[in-house]
Interface confidence: low
């Protein structure tokens, strides 16, 4: 009769470093001590006729254990294969490019250290939860790669690497390890430069909007914009609308920037840069300033009118040009009554980069002169009917403007000037019409001849 030596459990699977309870038993009636043959650390836990129980500890690798016993002068053996499974110690997705151009391939690279049994270990590369590649882990460490075509949809997508240790055939389930995700940033930067809209000329100490626009940019919100006037960086407001980026800034020219300058717009995305430059002339245009030697002149005095402006500016005063650009224009006159209220006009012209810029200014002269009564406006002999309504039309002039009063000779009777009044025979007589101001008096004699109305 043949007797058997059973080893239980048969072909167990356990986690690396774990312990295993092993039972060896035989139906041989005359069995001696049962031995466990293994290099593993073991401890006899219990034994009896035809059986022995052992505890194996710190099982770190695959191993074959053998139980043996002597029965009727011969040895019988039984064996069991221990399979140890080990989860990977490191599952890591290699860093992704900081920025990946849309439409170009990039490589996902996953490194797996340790993990056994290798035949049951699979490496999966993922975008979100979508499988991009599934490959067995072969070497140690295992490296698995996949080539991916970058798209807009990949911007901000998490990529990760997962290991699957499939111990389901052994009844232990599927052990999954996942790497830390890495986020991809994709971008589109057109080859065309930005559209830079800037003034051709900018006056010192003035401001003007500058616009820089680039279409077909993705993601527009991530782009960096640098706007500058010469070496002066401009404070830009950046707005995105879809794939269009618009940067707006206000350029203010300083006095030290006068001359030919450049406005620069740089758009940087994904470590790449697009640049646009526009020429700009910063100019200074002072004046024109029109001056009178006496804003208020006395009649007969000499008045000098001068007009000046900044360098390179050609001025023309009342049609008379200055000798050369940058020079003042002057004229002199003897102030007369007719010059009172006269305006002097000065125009200034500056050539900037082939364009002519114009500005105007004016000043008004006041001339002080004594009172006068215009005989043409003041009849010296009036024939009016009694009990009728009339107006004494007399006008005085002068600067300062004179007061005009008409008083009857030999009495203090006054008739209104320029206002309708009722005439009667008592108005008959000679009147002194006197215009007076701080600059003197002027008298004109007016005779009123009042014709009595017919009595009924």
């Amino acid at each position: 009769q043949e007797f058997l030596l059973r080893v239980e459990p048969q072909n167990p699977v356990l986690s690396a470093g774990g312990s295993l309870f092993v039972n060896c038993s035989t139906d041989c009636p005359s069995s001696e001590k049962i031995a466990l043959e293994t290099s593993l650390s073991k401890e006899l836990v219990a034994s009896g006729m035809g059986w022995a129980a052992f505890n194996l500890s710190n099982v770190t690798g695959n191993s074959r254990i053998l139980c043996s016993v002597y029965c009727n002068g011969s040895q019988i053996t039984g064996s069991s294969n221990i399979t140890v499974y080990r989860l990977p110690e490191r599952v890591e997705l290699a860093p992704l490019p900081p920025w990946q151009p849309v439409g170009q391939n990039f490589t996902l690279r996953c490194q797996v250290e340790d993990g056994s049994p290798r035949t049951s270990l699979t490496v999966v590369l993922l975008r979100w939860e979508e499988e991009l590649s599934r490959q067995p882990a072969v070497e140690e460490p295992a490296e698995v790669t996949a080539t991916v075509l970058a798209s807009r949809d990949d911007h901000g997508a998490p990529f990760s690497c997962r290991t699957e240790l499939d111990m389901q055939p052994q009844g232990l389930g599927l052990f999954v390890n996942t790497s830390a995700p890495r986020q991809l940033r994709t971008f589109v930067l057109p080859v065309t430069p930005p559209r830079l809209v800037a003034p051709r000329f900018l006056e010192v100490e003035t401001s003007w909007p500058v616009d820089c626009t680039l279409d077909g940019l993705f993601p527009a919100s991530e782009a960096q914009v640098y706007l500058a006037l010469g070496d002066q960086m401009l404070n830009a407001t950046v707005m995105n609308h879809g794939d269009t980026l618009t940067a707006t800034a206000t350029a203010t020219a300083r006095a030290d920037q006068e001359g030919a300058r450049e406005i620069v717009c740089n758009v940087t995305l994904g470590g790449e840069r697009r640049e646009a430059r526009e020429n700009l002339t910063v100019f200074s245009f002072l004046g024109p300033i029109v001056n009178l030697s006496e804003p208020t002149a006395h009649e007969g005095s000499t008045v000098t009118v001068s007009c000046m402006a900044g360098a390179r500016v050609q001025v023309t005063l009342d049609g008379v040009p200055a000798a050369a650009p940058g020079q003042p224009a002057q004229l002199q006159l003897n102030a007369t009554e007719s010059d009172d209220g006269r305006s002097f006009f000065c125009s200034a012209t500056l050539e900037v980069d082939g364009e002519f810029l114009h500005r105007n200014s004016s000043v008004q002269l006041r001339v002080l002169y004594g009172p006068k009564i215009d005989r043409a406006t003041c009849p010296q002999h009036l024939k009016w009917k009694d009990k009728t309504r009339h107006v004494l039309q007399c006008q005085a002039r002068g600067n300062p403007y004179p007061e005009l009063r008409c008083l009857k000779e030999g009495s203090s009777r006054e008739v209104p000037v320029g206002i309708p009044f009722f005439v009667n025979v008592t108005h008959n007589g000679t009147y002194q019409c006197q215009a007076s101001s701080s600059r003197g008096k002027y008298t004109l004699v007016v005779v009123m001849d009042i014709e009595a109305g017919s009595s009924h």
Epitope: V197, S207, T250
Partner: antibody, heavy 119, light 106 residues
């Protein structure tokens, strides 16, 4: 929001002058140039001139050079257009319009002021 | 002065039609602008810098061209599109407008 509000309709005799106002609100008045455009009844648009309120710099269409004056009062954010020596052919709707920088063209317009020149 | 000539001067079309208005400059310009005007109203900016839609303008409007020849296209006419359209340049003073194209219902 940006608004340009113009003064009311005017009836003038030939030889007289008219002054139309345009009050701006909703933006910084000195930053943008103000243009004036007119439209005779049943006709197209005709540009008259503009002012930079920041500097009082003006440019005019030579057709109006001697007769038009554009001014601006920054304290009230108001632009003015004065047309002198009026003739019957100046009968038109006069518009003020803001130039929003090269990117935007004449992006905001006043409601228009009808000026009628008749003896 | 740069003259801007639009063609046609007037045009009859139906709702849903595709319409093209051309604008020709007497000398080369960098950009043009298009405006829409309805009777009794101020003009409204449609397109700036030749091809950019102004804020709030429907995408059925588009602009193109360069140098001296420019076009405004309405891909599918809507009832509210019947109006007068003007092109404008400001390469040099004076700023000039085209004479206008009146778009009427057929």
């Amino acid at each position: 929001q940006v608004q340009l509000v113009q003064s009311g309709a005017e009836v003038k005799k030939p030889g007289a002058s008219v002054k139309v106002s345009c009050k701006a609100s909703g933006y910084t008045f000195t930053v943008y140039w103000m243009h004036w455009v007119r439209q005779a009844p049943g006709q197209g648009l005709e540009w008259m001139g503009y002012i930079n309120p920041n500097t009082d710099y003006t440019e005019y269409n030579q057709r109006f050079q001697k007769r038009v004056t554009i001014t601006a009062d920054t304290s009230t954010s108001t632009a003015y257009m004065e047309l002198s020596s009026l003739r019957s052919e100046d009968t038109a709707v006069y518009y003020c319009a803001r130039w929003g920088g090269n990117s935007y063209g004449l992006d905001y317009w006043g409601q228009g002021t009808l000026v009628t020149v008749s003896s | 002065d740069i003259q801007m000539t639009q063609s046609p001067s007037s045009l009859s079309a139906s709702v849903g039609d595709r319409v093209t208005i051309t604008c020709s400059a007497s000398s080369s310009v960098s950009y043009i602008y298009w405006y829409q005007q309805k009777p009794g109203k101020a003009p409204k900016l449609l397109i700036y810098l030749t091809s950019n839609l102004a804020s709030g303008v429907p995408s059925r409007f588009s602009g193109s061209g360069s140098g001296t020849d420019f076009t405004l296209t309405i891909s599918s006419l809507q009832p509210e599109d019947f109006a007068t359209y003007y092109c404008q340049q400001w390469k040099s003073i004076p700023l000039t407008f085209g004479q206008g194209t009146k778009l009427e219902i057929k």
